[in-house]
C-alpha cells in the first residue's frame, strides 16, 4: 500500500547546466493523494533558504505525479545557485533535496578574447 504522505522527488545532489538568456523550467515532482498541497520554491543563501515570492510558477499534472514549476524567462547569471521546494501538508513542512543550477553567461564568455587573440595581442590581458 502506497503512503499517502506528500513526497517531493527532487533528486539528491542534482545539477542542471543552463545558459543565461535561455528560458528554463525547474521542476519539483510532487506526489500527493487527495488535496494538492501548497508548494513553494526558495533559493539557498548559506544555511537559510530565501522564499521566492514574486516569481512565475505553474503546475503540470501527469497521471501519477504533478510538477510544481519555477519559470526562468530568461535565465539570468545571478540565477546560479541551489534551490529547494517545500510543501505544507497537514501542518507539516516537507522539504525537498536541493538542486543546483550552474549558469553559463554566454554573453561574457563570447566577449572574452580568444586564446589566439591573447597570443597575438598580449596587452589584452591587462586592459
Amino acid at each position: 500500500k502506497e503512503s499517502c504522505d506528500v513526497q517531493l522527488y527532487i533528486k539528491r545532489q542534482s545539477e542542471h547546466s543552463i545558459l543565461a538568456g535561455d528560458p528554463f523550467e525547474l521542476e519539483c515532482p510532487v506526489k500527493y493523494c487527495a488535496n494538492r498541497p501548497h508548494v513553494t520554491w526558495c533559493k539557498l543563501n548559506g544555511t537559510t533558504c530565501v522564499k521566492l515570492e514574486d516569481r512565475q510558477t505553474s503546475w503540470k499534472e501527469e497521471k501519477n505525479i504533478s510538477f510544481f514549476i519555477l519559470h526562468f524567462e530568461p535565465v539570468l547569471p545571478n540565477d546560479n545557485g541551489s534551490y529547494r521546494c517545500s510543501a505544507n501538508f497537514q501542518s507539516n513542512l516537507i522539504e525537498s533535496h536541493s538542486t543546483t543550477l550552474y549558469v553559463t553567461d554566454v554573453k561574457s564568455a563570447s566577449e572574452r578574447p580568444s586564446k589566439d587573440e591573447m597570443a597575438s595581442r598580449p596587452w589584452l590581458l591587462y586592459r
Epitope: 522527488y9 527532487i10 533528486k11 539528491r12 545532489q13 542534482s14 545539477e15 542542471h16 547546466s17 533535496h97
Partner: antibody
Framework: EVHLQQSGTELMKPGASVKLSCTAS????????MHWVKQRPEQGLEWIGR????????KFDPKFQGKATLTSDTSSNTAYLHFSSLTSEDAAVYYC????????????WGQGTSLTVSS | EVVMTQTPLTLSVTIGQSASISCKSS???????????LNWFLQRPGQSPKRLMH???KLDSGVPDRFTGSGSGTDFTLKISGVEAEDLGVYYC?????????FGGGTKLETK
C-alpha cells in the same frame, strides 16, 4: 518488479572502444540516477560514476574521468557506459545500478557485463 | 576522497554463530540533510551485489532480521546474529554522502 538487463560478454582488443548497455524495466530511468560499478577479477567494487538521465548530467570518480563516458536514452529506457582506448586494466565485470528518485541508495543491480581485453 | 576501511578482511564462522563486520570512514558521513548515506551490500559467489541495509540501519525488504546495522559519524557495524549458509559471501560497505562515492574493500564471510 524492477529489472536491469545488461548487454552480453565483450572480448575486445587493446586500443579499441566498447559501449556497454543497461536496459531498465519496471522503472522509468528519468526518475533515477544510473550508476556504474567496476569489479576486476577477484577484487572489490569501484564506483565509476553516475548519470542523471533526465538532463544528462554526469559525475565521475576522478580516476575514470576522461576514460569513461556515460550516456542514456530515455526513449529506450537504456543507460550506456562507453570506454575508449581499452587496456588490460579495463578488463572487469561492469554493473549498472539504479538509484530510484535519485536517493543515493543504489537499490537495484544489473547482472553485470564481463569485458575481456586481450590481443 | 572518503576512504572506507573494512575489518576483518576474512571472517571464519561456524553456522549458527554470530558475526560482526566493522566499517570506518575517513570523515563523518552525516550529510547536511541529517541523513547518513551508508549502505551494506552482500555479494554471494557468482552473483551481483545485493543491498542489505541502507541509511546505516534500515533493513531492505526480504532481508532477514538477523541482520542489524548500527553506527554514526565515522564508525559503522553490521551484525549477523546466527549466521546461515545463505549469508556466506563478501560484504561491502559504501558511502554515498560525498563524491566520489566509495566502497570498502570487502569482508569475506566463510565457514570454518
Amino acid at each position: 518488479e524492477v529489472h536491469l538487463q545488461q548487454s552480453g560478454t565483450e572480448l575486445m582488443k587493446p586500443g579499441a572502444s566498447v559501449k556497454l548497455s543497461c536496459t531498465a524495466s519496471g522503472l522509468n530511468i528519468r526518475d533515477t540516477y544510473m550508476h556504474w560499478v567496476k569489479q576486476r577479477p577477484e577484487q572489490g567494487l569501484e564506483w565509476i560514476g553516475r548519470i542523471d538521465p533526465a538532463n544528462g548530467n554526469t559525475k565521475f570518480d576522478p580516476k575514470f574521468q576522461g576514460k569513461a563516458t556515460l550516456t542514456s536514452d530515455t526513449s529506450s529506457n537504456t543507460a550506456y557506459l562507453h570506454f575508449s582506448s581499452l587496456t588490460s586494466e579495463d578488463a572487469a565485470v561492469y554493473y549498472c545500478v539504479s538509484d530510484h528518485y535519485g536517493s543515493s541508495l543504489l537499490d537495484y543491480w544489473g547482472q553485470g557485463t564481463s569485458l575481456t581485453v586481450s590481443s | 576522497e572518503v576512504v572506507m576501511t573494512q575489518t576483518p578482511l576474512t571472517l571464519s564462522v561456524t553456522i549458527g554463530q554470530s558475526a560482526s563486520i566493522s566499517c570506518k570512514s575517513s570523515q563523518s558521513l552525516l550529510d547536511s540533510d541529517g541523513k547518513t548515506y551508508l549502505n551494506w551490500f552482500l555479494q554471494r559467489p557468482g552473483q551481483s551485489p545485493k543491498r542489505l541495509m541502507h541509511l546505516v540501519s534500515k533493513l531492505d525488504s526480504g532481508v532477514p532480521d538477523r541482520f542489524t546495522g548500527s553506527g554514526s559519524g565515522t564508525d559503522f557495524t553490521l551484525k549477523i546474529s546466527g549466521v546461515e549458509a545463505e549469508d556466506l559471501g563478501v560484504y561491502y560497505c559504501w558511502q554515498g554522502t560525498y563524491f566520489p562515492y566509495t566502497f570498502g574493500g570487502g569482508t569475506k564471510l566463510e565457514t570454518k
